[in-house]
Amino acid sequence: EQAPGTAPCSRGSSWSADLDKCMDCASCRARPHSDFCLGCAAAPPAPFRLLWP
């Protein structure tokens, strides 16, 4: 659980109790079982621009 009173993690990141900080969801590529990856899976991905009209 994130400590009460702390700012929520920014979009594309998730709280890690193991590390006691917000972690970039891209890091789940290196270690998919990291504790913060559960939060990344639950959140929708950041929007992206289509490469075609």
Epitope: A17, D18, L19, D20, M23, D24, A26, S27, C28, R29, A30, R31, P32, H33, S34
Partner: antibody, heavy 120, light 112 residues
Framework: QVQLVQSGAEVKKPGASVKVSCKAS????????IAWVKQAPGQGLEWIGE????????YYSEKFRGKATLTADTSTSTAYMELSSLRSEDTAVYFC?????????????WGQGTLVTVSS | DIVMTQSPLSLPVTPGEPASISCRSS???????????LYWYLQKPGQSPQLLIY???NRASGVPDRFSGSGSGTDFTLKISRVEAEDVGVYYC?????????FGQGTKVEIK
């Protein structure tokens, strides 16, 4: 450069305990996991557990729960593994290894190993 | 726990010739992100293990391009295109999909 330097070889009697150290340098100690791996004589590699040094949170293999205790001292950038109630089957080389958590995968770094011999 | 099984356990090789080692996992190492979490390590005599290949096919920093990894799901292969004398040692496959971290039994590569 990243370095993990382990303590020297130990000879212990059955029933005793031993504490192996792993001193890290060349990176921010609290940003990476330290894992511990056992290699019995002539055998393969066996994961014991790992610790997040910044928070002290630990994960253990079921086989080593109650046998190994992992701790870390952030003031000296040193991780420790204590093995209790030693038996002959605990005779092995024990390695510490830094494991990455980050997207920019920069590989694992291993200590040189510490030989623990349990003999009466 | 994921069980990793290697073959062969012993591999006599001739310098300059190719060699390959197989590794099978008891469950798929292919994550929903389309990455195979299979790793290869080499432990040279009297040394610590060193990472050769991560995520099935990516060479670790400083690893010669004669080493390559391939496969998918549960079946993986490490290939050495031309074996050199310095390649002797025990090769281990391992996964990084979940805890516990498990390794294959090891394949001992030695010069004929």
């Amino acid at each position: 450069q990243v370095q993990l330097v382990q303590s020297g070889a130990e000879v212990k009697k059955p029933g005793a305990s031993v504490k192996v150290s792993c001193k890290a340098s060349g990176y921010t100690f609290t940003d990476f996991i330290i894992a511990w791996v056992k290699q019995a004589p002539g055998q393969g590699l066996e994961w014991i557990g790992e610790i997040y040094p910044g928070t002290g949170r630990t994960y253990y293999s079921e086989k080593f729960r109650g046998k190994a205790t992992l701790t870390a001292d952030t003031s000296t950038s040193t991780a420790y593994m204590e093995l209790s109630s030693l038996r002959s089957e605990d005779t092995a080389v024990y390695f510490c290894a830094r494991r990455t958590i980050y997207y920019d995968y920069d590989g694992d770094y291993w200590g040189q190993g510490t030989l623990v011999t349990v003999s009466s | 726990d994921i069980v990793m099984t290697q073959s062969p356990l012993s591999l006599p090789v001739t310098p300059g010739e190719p060699a390959s080692i197989s590794c099978r996992s008891s469950q798929s190492l292919l994550h929903s992100n389309w990455i195979n979490y299979l790793y290869w390590y080499l432990q040279k005599p009297g040394q610590s293990p060193q990472l050769l290949i991560y995520q099935m096919s990516n060479r670790a920093s400083g690893v010669p391009d004669r080493f390559s990894g391939s496969g998918s799901g549960t079946d993986f292969t490490l290939k050495i295109s031309r074996v050199e004398a310095e390649d002797v040692g025990v090769y281990y496959c391992a996964h990084n999909l979940e805890l516990p971290w498990t390794f294959g039994q090891g394949t001992k590569v030695e010069i004929k």
